[in-house]
């Protein structure tokens, strides 16, 4: 037989299918111009000393073979012997070892049998009522199709499906969405209406997301805050990364979770933007104030269920740094200023009350003043800390305002509202004899102690009513006691006791009259 | 004004050293976090070195350990960089930042004040 034509003779090799796993498979013949064919096959299995034998029967039942040796296509012309209009049958057999293998057969009208592509480019992917959507453009010249896919998951093998027909410039498929796992997809194509025609290869793989982005697990943890008024944010525990079916492992795209980090500052609500979005990875530096923290997880198909932790405030106080004076008109509030150009922003609230209940102040950018102070003042009108009572207040500071991450802590500290030198003034101010010549004084603490760091000392003033002398004695803000000696008996005294603040003198008490009596010896 | 202004770049043969300045003016340094980054033609700016505003803490780009010190200097409102054992891999022009990151993004993070860079070249 010449090797161009198909010989009509048995084949060299015993006619017996050993029927093993490995042989040749997925066979495709097509028409590849006017009067040339070709057929082509895989083989599965060592591959050295194989020789591939391609068998075609006609209808009239005579049957006739090419000899393909090592190779895994074949051309021939429509002179080859093979009959082009009429239908026949193929399969390839292959020589190997002493046995034959066989693939599965083919029945075809070769001249009707277009060589069919797969999707190729780019393959949409949205999800529609609960199910996956796949669309692509129509090969070109290839309009009228029959479509399958096949998908697996990382713990399942190849599943077929049918797209059913196809016929237009753009094709789709309706495939299972799976909720909690990634899976692979491909898509083959054949003519629509040709009998026996050969599937097109599988197209490449498109990787695709569950329907539910998996819950981010992530730990965070929050570094103590600087002298810059900052604290870093960092991860403690990265996401755990989906697990993907085999072809999408390496670059899978489409499978891809991003984890985006929300940020909402609670403190200071008073400021025009509260809430950023970042990728999570980038770590922001934070300040002092509250703050929730979101973890959103989110595919193609959107946004997932988030994790959300609250950083509460560092309240961590600095007694010192805030100079407040108190004037007829109203108070102002002086502190070292950070830079030129900065706003700050000024929250109060009452302490042991919701943090819900805080009230703030934004100023407008404020240079330093010739001390190097930034001052907030506000008048008693305004209502701004003017109950008697005691104060945590906090000034944030940015440079850039509109920018969340931006906002540093200057301080934090205690502050007594309203006329705190009237309102701290002690009261049940009371004297005991304490010997012949001393007596001890006890009064109730103040309100101001209720307020950290505002109480400075208690001062007690002794007035000696014959001499009109006064003395005066400091006793720590933590004592509500002092002894008074060197006292003389029958002699009228009084005695006041005023709480003051670093920034103010408080009020003396109502005078107490006492006297140390004569002592009368028997 | 507020402003960063970075000095002491310059041409260096391979093995030599540079010192370089961080000026800032119109804020007070010691409340801010600093740092180094660099950009070399055609690739992305990286971290190069940050201290802390606090503790003083440093954290260094592993290319540059044990060969760059930063530190820096409240009172004269300056923070510097001392690069000994340049590599011609060193090209690059400097920049000054705050707050520091270790991982430079200009799209992840925001910064406070930056410097418009001085340029640091390696070569024989």
């Known amino acids: 037989c010449r090797t161009s034509e198909c010989c009509f003779q048995d084949p060299p090799y015993p006619d017996a299918d050993s029927g093993s796993a490995s042989g040749p498979r997925d066979l495709r013949c097509y028409r590849i111009s006017s009067d040339r064919y070709e057929c082509s096959w895989q083989y599965e299995g060592p591959t050295a000393g194989v020789s591939h034998f391609l068998r075609c029967c006609l209808s009239s039942g005579r049957c006739c073979y090419f000899a393909a040796g090592s190779a895994t296509r074949l051309q021939f012309s429509d002179q080859a012997g093979v009959s082009v209009l009429y239908t026949v049958t193929l399969w390839v057999e292959s020589w190997a070892r002493n046995q034959t293998e066989k693939s599965p057969e083919v029945t075809l009208q070769l001249y009707n049998s277009v060589k069919y592509e797969p999707p190729l480019g780019d393959i949409k992917v949205s999800k529609l009522a609960g199910q996956l959507r796949m669309e692509w453009e129509t090969p070109d010249n290839q309009v009228g199709a029959e479509v399958q896919f096949r998908h697996r998951t990382p713990s399942s093998p190849w599943k077929l499906g049918d797209c059913g027909p196809q016929d237009d410039d753009t094709e789709s498929c309706l495939c299972p969405l799976e909720m909690n796992v990634a899976q692979e997809f491909q898509l083959r194509r054949r003519q629509l209406g040709s009998q026996g025609s050969s599937w097109s290869k599988w197209s490449s793989p498109v990787c695709v997301p569950p329907e539910n982005p998996p819950q981010p697990q992530v730990r965070f943890s929050v570094e103590q805050l600087g002298q810059d008024g900052r604290r870093r944010l960092t991860l403690k525990e990265q996401p755990t990364q989906l697990e993907l079916p085999e072809g999408c492992q390496g670059l899978a795209p489409g499978t891809e979770v991003t984890y985006r980090l929300q940020l909402h500052m609670l403190s200071c609500p008073c400021k025009a933007k509260a809430t950023r979005t970042l990728h999570l990875g980038k770590m922001p530096y934070l300040s002092g104030a509250a703050y929730n923290v979101a973890v959103i997880s989110s595919n193609q198909f959107g946004p997932g269920l988030n994790q959300t932790w609250h950083i509460p405030a560092d309240t961590h106080t600095e007694p010192v740094a805030l100079n407040i004076s108190v004037g007829t008109n109203g108070t102002t509030m002086y502190w070292p200023a950070r830079a030129q150009s900065m706003t700050y922003c000024i929250e109060w609230q009452p302490v042991g009350q919701d943090g819900g209940l805080a009230t703030c102040s934004l100023t407008a950018p404020q240079d330093p003043d010739p001390a190097g102070m930034a001052t907030y003042s506000w008048s008693r009108e305004s209502g701004a800390m003017g109950q008697e009572k005691c104060y945590y207040i906090t000034i944030f500071a940015s440079a850039h305002p509109e920018k969340l991450t931006l906002w540093s802590t200057v301080l934090s500290t205690y502050h007594f509202g309203g006329n705190a030198s009237a309102a701290g003034t002690p009261h049940h101010v009371s004297v005991k004899n304490h010997s012949l010549d001393s007596v001890s004084v006890d009064w109730a603490p103040s309100l101001l102690s209720t307020c950290p760091g505002v109480l400075k000392e208690y001062v007690v003033r002794c007035r000696d009513e014959d001499s009109k002398q006064v003395s005066e004695h400091p006793v720590q803000p933590t004592e509500t006691q002092v002894t008074l000696s060197g006292l003389r008996a029958g002699v009228a005294y009084t005695v006041q006791v005023r709480a003051d603040t670093a920034w103010l003198r408080g009020v003396w008490s109502q005078p107490q009259r006492f006297s140390i009596e004569v002592q009368v010896s028997d | 004004e507020v402003q960063l202004v970075e000095s002491g770049g310059g041409l260096v043969q391979p093995g030599g050293s540079l010192r370089l300045s961080c000026a800032a003016s119109?804020?007070?340094?010691?409340?801010?976090?600093i740092g180094w980054f660099r950009q070399a033609p055609g690739k992305e700016r990286e971290g190069v070195s940050c201290i802390s505003s606090s503790d003083r803490s440093t954290w260094y780009a592993d290319s540059v350990k044990g060969r760059f010190t930063i530190s820096r200097d409240n009172a004269k409102n300056t923070v510097y960089l001392q690069m000994h054992s340049l590599k011609p891999e060193d090209t690059a022009v400097y920049y000054c930042a705050t707050p520091c990151y270790s991982d430079y993004d200009p799209e992840g993070y925001e910064y406070d004040y930056w410097g418009q860079g001085t340029q640091v070249t390696v070569s024989s």
């Open positions: 119109g804020f007070t340094l010691d409340y801010y976090a």
